[in-house]
């Protein structure tokens, strides 16, 4: 049986338009092969009327089009100005007419009861505006103008020139009479509802000499665009509703049962708790278009989404809308990574961020999701050597371990660091992941002095105490800079006495700076790692001052005078302009994630079982 699907029977009336959607499996071959609409002949052939390669038969010239939507696995044939001659048997298909995959469609066009030959058909999208034009003759110029809707057998008055408005149309309809030169009046209906569809009659005058015009109004609900994304990945909904709603509140909602649509996010500041930390509504353009990015996709995110505009910030009858059907592919190419990482005040975390391994040269970014208003994700660090000023000395993005994963290390943690962070690149926008950092009770595992002052020309030794739990880890000292942390030689001084209940496996590893120069001033980290996987780190700021008295300096833990929550950043540190990610592909001078390709998965991207994978700060 053919895998192509469409409607078997299509019925319409003369003058109308039809939109026939044919579905095909969206394989790579099918997406790119020829699509066609042909009419079956009596002897079995099928004459092409229109195809995706640009051919249009003379019978269809100016009244038909075929549009392929490869990402959805659909193509749509629109045929306008139908006549009874269009009745017949057709095929929609892929490939070659005689041998391709196809589906049989029967089209029947009738005159239709109650539709007069002069009926004008108006086909308008839900929530939009229609203008019904009604001509009249000079003798009726001064007479009452009216519009009726046919309800069952009876015409019901909708609006007239004496000021009457049917309650169903209050606040969204007007009757305009053109200037004296034009024998025409118009009825404009805004915020069209599905219930507005039907047959209308406009009339000038009330006697036997009145002028009448029939109209058939079709209100179309948007066909949902099919979107397939990977579990743990991200999706972007681009919503373009038109400039007429540029100043109206926008929303994205998810349909639950029937016509209910629960707000996911809107421009009035509402956000569904399930999307905390992993959603951004990007500011709208002047034309009213906007986009919503959701990261850390879960199985339960699958469903039908609508974006729209309404002053209430939620779906109401008459809201212009766009629709998507989101499918979440559980056979994801995006590897599982912890969605929660825990650290202690004064301690550190090392976050592993996945990226598309085919894009190893892409720029990597890490941003902090902020929930205020519509959500934003200001950039904190990138792989090109930029670090936000407030994070200097305590944040580093490392390309290691590579091959599809990079590492972000954040130390000197405070309670203010708790929150949702996004990993992203300027490449594949689907590979945006979110991690939540939680600050828990406890003490940092690595012990270093707080502030250290070195003297020009002298030797400085800075200790770092590693508990026995890190006995099997590689221990290192490095000097932090914007591009990473450059390893420095260090000395193992034997077991540490800084830990109670810790045996000979604890370690004191010192950093020695000989003949200190001004260039030695800065941040130094001690840390642990296993191969290319980083664990905990601790940071020390070394200040350099003029010689006061001779001798070398050996710093002990007792001199650690900075509280965990204190920032020991020197006011002289240069400020890098505030950078926040706009779509990392579009960065202009601002690094702010806009389309942002930035979404953060907040609430824990659930991983299969539904329980979040957690990662402690003390090991990878």
């Amino acid at each position: 049986k053919s895998p192509i699907f469409g409607p078997e029977e299509v019925n319409s009336v003369e003058g109308n338009s039809v939109s026939i959607t044919c579905y095909y499996p969206p394989t790579s071959v099918n997406r790119h092969t020829r699509k066609y609409w042909c009419r079956q002949g009596a002897r079995g052939g099928c004459i092409t009327l229109i195809s995706s390669e640009g051919y249009v038969s003379s019978k269809y010239a100016g009244r038909a089009n075929l549009t392929n939507f490869p990402e959805n696995g659909t193509f749509v044939v629109n045929i306008a100005q139908l006549s009874q001659d269009d009745s017949g048997r057709y095929k929609c298909g892929l490939g070659i007419n005689s041998r391709g995959l196809s589906f049989d469609v029967s089209l029947e066009v009738s005159q239709g009861p109650g539709l007069l030959n002069d009926t004008k058909v108006y086909t308008v999208d839900l929530g939009r505006t229609v203008t019904i034009n009604c001509p009249f003759k000079t003798e009726n110029a001064q007479k009452r103008k009216s519009l009726y809707k046919q309800i069952g057998l009876y015409p019901v008055l909708v609006i007239d020139s004496s000021g009457y408005v049917n309650p169903n149309y209050t606040g969204r309809i007007r009757l305009d009479i053109q200037g004296t030169g034009q024998l025409l009046f118009s009825v404009v209906i805004n915020q069209l509802r599905l219930s507005d569809a039907g047959q209308y009659l406009c009339q000038a005058g009330d006697d036997s000499n009145s002028n009448k015009k029939n109209a058939d109004l079709q209100v179309l609900k948007p066909e949902p665009e099919l979107v397939y994304e990977d579990l743990r990945g991200s999706v972007t909904f681009h919503c373009a509703l038109g400039p007429e709603v540029a100043n109206v509140a926008k929303f994205l909602c998810r349909q639950s049962s029937g016509e209910n649509c629960d707000v996911v996010v809107n421009t009035l500041g509402k956000r569904a708790p399930a999307f905390e930390g992993r959603i951004l509504l990007n500011p709208q353009d002047k034309d009213g278009s906007f986009s919503v990015v959701i990261t850390g996709l879960r199985k339960e995110d699958a469903g039908r989404y609508l974006c729209g505009a309404h002053s209430d910030g939620q779906l109401q009858e008459g809201s212009p809308i766009q629709a998507w059907q989101l499918f979440v592919n559980e056979e994801s190419t995006i590897p599982r990574s912890p969605t929660v990482v825990k650290g202690v005040a004064g301690g550190s975390v090392a976050v592993l961020c996945p990226y598309n391994r085919k894009e190893s040269k892409s720029i990597k970014y890490w941003c902090l999701w902020e929930g205020a208003q519509n959500g934003r994700c200001p950039l904190l660090v990138d792989s090109e050597g930029w670090v936000k000023a407030q994070y200097e000395g305590r944040l580093s993005l490392l390309e290691e371990p590579g091959n599809g994963t990079f590492t972000v290390i954040l130390n000197q943690l405070t309670s203010r660091d708790a929150g949702f962070y996004w990993c992203l690149t300027n490449g594949d926008t689907l590979w945006r992941t979110t991690v939540e950092i939680k600050i828990i009770e406890g003490e940092p595992n690595l012990k270093v002095p707080g502030n250290v002052t070195a003297v020009l020309g002298e030797t400085l030794k800075v200790p770092c105490h590693f508990p026995c739990k890190f006995s099997s880890y590689e221990k290192y000292w490095c000097k932090w800079n914007n591009t990473g942390c450059q390893a420095l030689p260090s000395q193992d001084e034997g077991p540490s006495k800084a830990f109670v209940n810790c045996d000979e496996n604890s370690r004191l590893v010192s950093l020695t700076l000989n003949l200190v120069t001004r260039a030695d001033e800065g941040w130094y980290w001690c840390g642990v790692k296993q191969g290319h996987f980083y664990g905990e780190t601790a940071a020390v700021y070394v200040a350099v001052e003029e010689r006061k008295a001779a001798g070398s300096r050996d710093v002990s833990l007792a001199k650690a005078d900075a509280a965990p929550d204190e920032k020991v950043l020197d006011s002289g540190f240069r400020e890098i302009e505030n950078k926040a990610i706009q779509d990392p592909r579009l960065f202009a001078e601002e690094k702010a994630v806009a389309d942002t390709r930035d979404q953060a998965d907040g609430s824990r991207a659930s991983v299969d079982s539904g329980s979040s994978e957690e990662q402690g700060g003390s090991s990878r």
Partner: nanobody, 129 residues
Framework: EVQLVESGGGSVQAGGSLRLSCAAS????????MGWFRQAPGKEREGVAL???????????SHADSVKGRFTISRDNAKNTVYLQMNSLKPEDSAMYYC???????????????????WGKGTLVTISS
């Protein structure tokens, strides 16, 4: 909340006819996909007919191969009701018949996820030979 109420089921002899009705509330039958499905004891639910109408004068429909030429789906937009006219009934048509509604256009694929539909409680059709 979508509510679909089926009626018109019953027992008839093979070769007879029945007309099922489905009164919908909470969803307009135009501009949405309406369908009839059936489930015989011990069998999986299967599609019978689908209908998508954009106006009082335009509609698109499909019928399952097993009922083609015998069953016809139709609608009355004013009453927000969908019908299934069943002629030349056979014993194998015996089943519980369900009316279903899905937001938006029909996908025309009988295997298309049934979890996207809202369902009525069903009406029983029994055909004796």
């Amino acid at each position: 909340e979508v509510q679909l109420v089926e009626s018109g089921g019953g027992s008839v002899q093979a070769g007879g006819s029945l007309r099922l009705s489905c009164a919908a509330s909470g969803i307009t039958i135009s501009n949405n996909c309406m369908g009839w499905f059936r489930q015989a004891p011990g069998k999986e639910r299967e599609g019978v007919a689908l209908l998508y109408s954009t106006s009082s004068t335009s509609s698109q429909k499909s019928h399952a191969d097993s009922v083609k030429g015998r069953f016809t789906i139709s609608r009355d937009n004013a009453k927000n009701t969908v019908y299934l006219q069943m002629n030349s009934l056979k014993p194998e048509d015996s089943a519980m018949y369900y009316c279903a509604a899905k937001s938006g256009v029909c996908r025309w694929n009988w295997e298309y996820g049934m979890d996207y539909w809202d369902w009525g409680k069903g009406t029983l059709v029994t055909i004796s030979s």
